[in-house]
């Protein structure tokens, strides 16, 4: 079995005779790639196309959140008759090329992901020279990244009635479920505020009263991992402040 | 079955011209490029060029620029190397190669070889 | 052009033995190709963009390298494998192949 241009077969009646049939624009993506948090990941992204064996001048470019208008992370360049296609935008410097576009593969290389990266890609090429055509990937890929819980931010503020609450953030995926510790307490759930708009890894939970001194601990935990962090609370006595 | 036969072995004399053919059997030349490659005992292989038997477009190697001509005929399904004011340095086995199924990688198919003896 | 040039130009190993063999490039390339060529035959193709097999290809081949360094390695030398290997680029016109490696069997 010989695989032409599109994966398909064809004989000429009454030949032997293999023809590449007239290809279309398509663009094959998964629906979803998953990675942890500070590994790498690589978006799949093939294609075909109608202008056979097109050797000129290509860009290959992909954006991210929206298609055909969403912010370029990536864009090069290749020469008529070159595989090499010469980085011009790389955002950040953690994205590359890994696919052959000359063999129409535009597959990108993520490194050191960070959970601002869970978002749809899309890719998309663009032909110059004697031929000028350019095609996007519609529904693109999900870049789904999870991570372990990461304690962001541990304080302790001032509340009205000189009393004071802690608040606990966290970020993580899947979103961590936040616990409180500490003097009477025991192992409390606390207050968890779900998670906030355009911040969806990150999670609060506040704990409205310190009735004690002592150490308040918060601990995050998914199922990747778990994370804690301290604050400690001392009031002066005769004084409205506090030491954290 | 994707075949690639080339013409015989040639014996020809300094300065004479040779013309190469490449007869294609399993798919159709005009659908991917049609290369042609060099090979000499001490010098490995060596790119000629390309072309593209549907509209004539065709890549050179700089060095062989004057001295190959390549050309293709789809109604035969043959492409054509000729090699004019022939030297000793021309004296080698010349490959006909396509890209076809190049998912697999290039240079998918080579034919036999012409070897090409230049002697007086 | 870019020049691709292959070392050593001539190599023997025994059965079993870890071969490598390299291709540097005079200008940066984004993939690299190799071929297998016995003596009075045909060349084959044998990786491509730099690390897959083509088909037929035994596993213990790994291709490997970025840039301008490359290098073929085979993790056990099995007799078979003895033939010459060349590299070949297509990052710029005119595409090259390097000089050959042959491997010898001892």
């Known amino acids: 079995f010989v695989r032409t241009k599109i994966d398909t077969t064809e004989n000429l009646l009454n030949t032997e005779v293999h023809s590449s049939p007239a290809q279309r624009w398509s663009m094959q993506v998964p629906p979803e790639v998953s990675a942890e948090a500070g590994d790498a990941a690589v978006l799949p992204c093939t294609f075909t196309h109608p202008h056979r064996h097109y050797d000129g001048p290509l860009t290959a470019i992909w954006r991210a959140g929206e298609p055909y208008a969403g912010p370029q992370v990536f864009r090069c360049a290749a020469a008529r008759g070159s595989e090499l296609c010469q980085t011009a935008l790389s955002l950040h410097g953690r994205f590359r090329l890994l696919g052959n576009p000359r063999r129409n593969d535009l597959s990108l290389r993520v490194e050191r992901l960070a959970l601002a990266d869970d978002r749809r890609y899309f890719c998309r090429v663009e032909f110059a020279g004697d031929v000028h055509d350019r095609y996007e990937s519609r529904h693109g890929v999900r870049l789904h990244v999870t991570a372990a819980p990461r304690i962001v931010n541990i304080s302790v503020l001032p509340s009205p009635a000189h009393a004071f609450r802690a608040l606990c953030t966290a970020e993580g995926e899947p979103p961590p479920a936040l616990a409180w510790s500490g003097p009477a307490l025991g192992n409390s759930l606390a207050a968890v505020r779900s998670p906030r708009e355009g911040h969806g890894h990150l999670v609060t939970a506040e704990l409205p009263a310190l009735t004690h001194d002592g150490r308040y601990t918060c601990t995050a935990a998914n199922s990747l991992g778990r994370s804690e962090a301290s604050v400690y609370l001392f009031r002066f006595h005769g004084a409205s402040g506090a030491s954290t | 079955e994707v075949q690639l036969q080339q013409s015989g072995a040639e014996l020809v004399r300094p300065g004479a011209s040779v013309k190469l053919s490449c007869t294609a059997s399993?798919?159709?030349?005009?659908?991917?490029?049609m290369h042609w490659v060099k090979e000499r005992p001490e010098q490995g292989l060596e790119w000629i060029g390309r072309?593209?038997?549907?509209?004539?477009?065709?890549e050179y190697d700089p060095k062989f620029q004057g001295k190959a001509t390549m050309t293709a005929d789809t109604s035969s399904n043959t492409a054509y190397l000729q090699f004019s004011s022939l030297t000793s340095e021309d004296t080698a086995v010349y490959y006909c190669?396509?890209?076809?199924?190049?998912?697999?990688?290039?240079?998918?198919?080579w034919g036999q070889g012409t070897l090409v003896t230049v002697s007086a | 052009q870019i020049i691709l040039t292959q070392s050593p130009a001539i190599m023997s190993a025994s059965p079993g033995e870890k071969v490598t063999m390299t291709c540097s490039a005079s200008?940066?390339?984004?993939?690299m190709h190799w071929y297998q060529q016995k003596p009075g035959t045909s060349p084959k193709r044998w990786i491509f963009?730099?690390?897959k097999l083509a088909s037929g290809v035994p596993g213990r081949f790994i291709g490997s390298g970025s840039g301008t360094s490359y290098s073929l390695t085979i993790s056990t030398m099995e007799a078979e494998d003895a033939a010459t290997y060349y590299c070949?680029?297509?990052?710029?016109?005119?595409?090259?192949f390097g000089g050959g490696t042959k491997l010898e069997i001892k």
């Open positions: 070949h680029q297509r990052s710029a016109y005119p595409w090259t």
């Open positions: 072309i593209d038997p549907e509209d004539g477009d065709i």
């Open positions: 963009d730099t690390s």
């Open positions: 190669v396509t890209d076809y199924d190049y998912d697999g990688g290039w240079f998918a198919y």
């Open positions: 399993g798919f159709n030349i005009k659908d991917y490029y």
């Open positions: 200008s940066s390339t984004s993939f």
